[in-house]
Amino acid sequence: WELTILHTNDVHSRLEQTSEDSSKCVNASRCMGGVARLFTKVQQIRRAEPNVLLLDAGDQYQGTIWFTVYKGAEVAHFMNALRYDAMALGNHEFDNGVEGLIEPLLKEAKFPILSANIKAKGPLASQISGLYLPYKVLPVGDEVVGIVGYTSKETPFLSNPGTNLVFEDEITALQPEVDKLKTLNVNKIIALGHSGFETDKLIAQKVRGVDVVVGGHSNTFLYTGNPPSKEVPAGKYPFIVTSDDGRKVPVVQAYAFGKYLGYLKIEFDERGNVISSHGNPILLNSSIPEDPSIKADINKWRIKLDNYSTQELGKTIVYLDGSSQSCRFRECNMGNLICDAMINNNLRHADEMFWNHVSMCILNGGGIRSPIDERNNGTITWENLAAVLPFGGTFDLVQLKGSTLKKAFEHSVHRYGQSTGEFLQVGGIHVVYDLSRKPGDRVVKLDVLCTKCRVPSYDPLKMDEIYKVILPNFLANGGDGFQMIKDELLRHDSGDQDINVVSTYISKMKVIYPAVEGRIK
């Protein structure tokens, strides 16, 4: 019996087609992805093959103005329109709190939404009961397939799930649910979830009875053969893991942003054992036409976005200096504003020991593309912010050793004075450079804001200590020559859309007046 699994993950609000790098589509003839194009390909496969499941491994939420405006209603609407069979909860599904998940998505989705390792407690338990499930048995033709969901246990550090959801260890939570499916005579089981490729592989290895793992979170690109676009494969598709009980378990992921549709064909024997598995992600490029009906619906929903982008978010009473003449040479108040917004967006998970889990921000000055003039009645709009941060990136959370941070700051000024983009703007950091010294030895003082303290203060950076830092995904991926970050980071979790982070902060503050205050000397 053959099953076709179509899968997406980390779509992050890319409802419209995008450019090849998943930013705003400029030249339509070279654009990719989007739900209208995805629908065309999905329908093509559904028509050609008998047993097809369309699955999503989480993080539909967060990433473009679509999510900012529609807050998840767009996810439910278009996933329903594409007729998804199941979805696993990702960490970003909690970005607007539990209410922001329940109302727009859980109550509106026609398909089951899954996670076995999230347990509700207190008053939330009854409110959310039945709205998401640990598993679902799906009929496919004359057979049944069990889908069991999981979500990153780091979600409380990455999003806003509140205090009434407990995120258990994935493997510990999955095993009893898989065992339950086995007792229901379900012998074909897919683990669908959002914890990253390393955890996906562990699930394949450790959870008895899981036949296939469909993952997300790490934006992993797997491919067999010559890859069709810019993404470099992290391994073959499917990636085969030998389980502890000796089975060959295929593990798949489909990069991110709706650029690819994962396509996996699995052959099962009559006892539900995987006999063979093969496939590849399908690049959703312009050779696949956008479905006209879905496209028309997208255009209808788009109208509200255009109206939103010109509305006032808040006011500034000072000039927001985002000029390259400032931000690539010295501390600039636009850099301070953005870093303060980045930290504010990550205020969560305080306890008796820590006032917050992260206090530091770094931001390449070259990523700040425009100033905002306060003389326009002080008005700040989404449109203004899109000019400052035009690349459609995210502000991510990484863990780095102090020694890596020191290298990053040396790199920041290794060729100072040439108006290059690597000059770092900061938050929660005080750095002193001596530019008379030779490159690689110019950082003379580097103090960082403590997190394990009741009164935050600046302490000298310790080389062997592990620090959490918020930074643009561009830097986490080694951009602007920050190879040491990419090579030495100990953990990387994708965060929220950059413009959204700053716009939320400005809306919250109402009136802003960031200063140049001696963070960089």
Epitope: F39, Q43, R46, R47, A81, R83, D85, K110, F111, L138, P139, V140, G141, D142, E143, V144, D291, S293, I294, A296, D297
Partner: antibody
């Protein structure tokens, strides 16, 4: 082979009740949404009810809502339509039809031969 | 509710003719449209689903096209056994609705 056989039709007075059955064979009944569709004499097709594969959801058009109830017994591979408060305009051939395997609306790939219901005093 | 309008309501054609029947939805239904054939005193038979996919066992002279609101059923070369009534049906949303039917008669 795949087959649907309806039964239970007949002549009934207005205001009375009737229960139709549909016996399924040749496929995994519990995996499919099942529908009732009717056709008044000399008229077109009208959808009457659906019950999803697991019985979790049922949908009806306004014309029968509150009067007709669809149900299924997966252990007996049987679909039912309980029709109460029958009216003259309910007179039709009632077909049982197989839908899809999910919770989305679907088309009908297999049809029964139909059973005639006549509502007349 | 989504209204389905079929045209023509009847047509006369000869064996070998190319026949086209149209179906219009009152609102967009993407490609969630099916076509059925019904002969007198018989149950309907599924021909096409998802606007253009041929049900297994249906001759290739039948084809469907369209998306959104406008759909077409084409019989490329009418055969004697094709004289029947044809119905379209939307399954975009409940309540499911049928077109009024097109009766194809012998000229």
């Amino acid at each position: 082979q795949v087959q649907l056989v309806e039964s239970g039709g007949g002549v009934v007075q207005p205001g009375r009740s009737l229960r139709l059955s549909c016996a399924a064979s040749g496929f995994t009944f519990s995996n499919y949404g099942m529908h009732w569709v009717r056709q008044a004499p000399g008229k077109g097709l009208e959808w009457v009810a659906v019950i999803l594969y697991d019985g979790s959801n049922k949908y009806y058009p306004d014309s029968v809502k509150g009067r007709f109830t669809i149900s299924r017994d997966n252990s007996k591979n049987t679909l039912y339509l309980q029709m109460n408060s029958l009216r003259a305009e309910d007179t039709a051939v009632y077909y049982c039809a197989r839908g899809g395997s999910s919770w989305y609306p679907d088309s009908f790939d297999i049809w029964g031969q139909g059973t005639m219901v006549t509502v007349s005093s | 509710d989504i209204q389905m309008t079929q045209s023509p309501s009847s047509l006369s054609a000869s064996v070998g003719d190319r026949v086209t029947i149209t179906c219009r939805a009152s609102q967009g239904i993407s490609s969630w449209l099916a076509w059925y054939q019904q002969k007198p005193e018989k149950a309907p038979k599924s021909l096409i689903y998802a606007a253009s996919s041929l049900q297994s066992g249906v001759p290739s002279r039948f084809s469907g096209s369209g998306s959104g609101t406008d759909f077409t059923l084409t019989i490329s070369s009418l055969q004697p056994e094709d004289f029947a009534t044809y119905y379209c049906q939307q399954y975009n949303s409940y309540p499911l609705t049928f077109g009024g039917g097109t009766k194809v008669e012998i000229k």
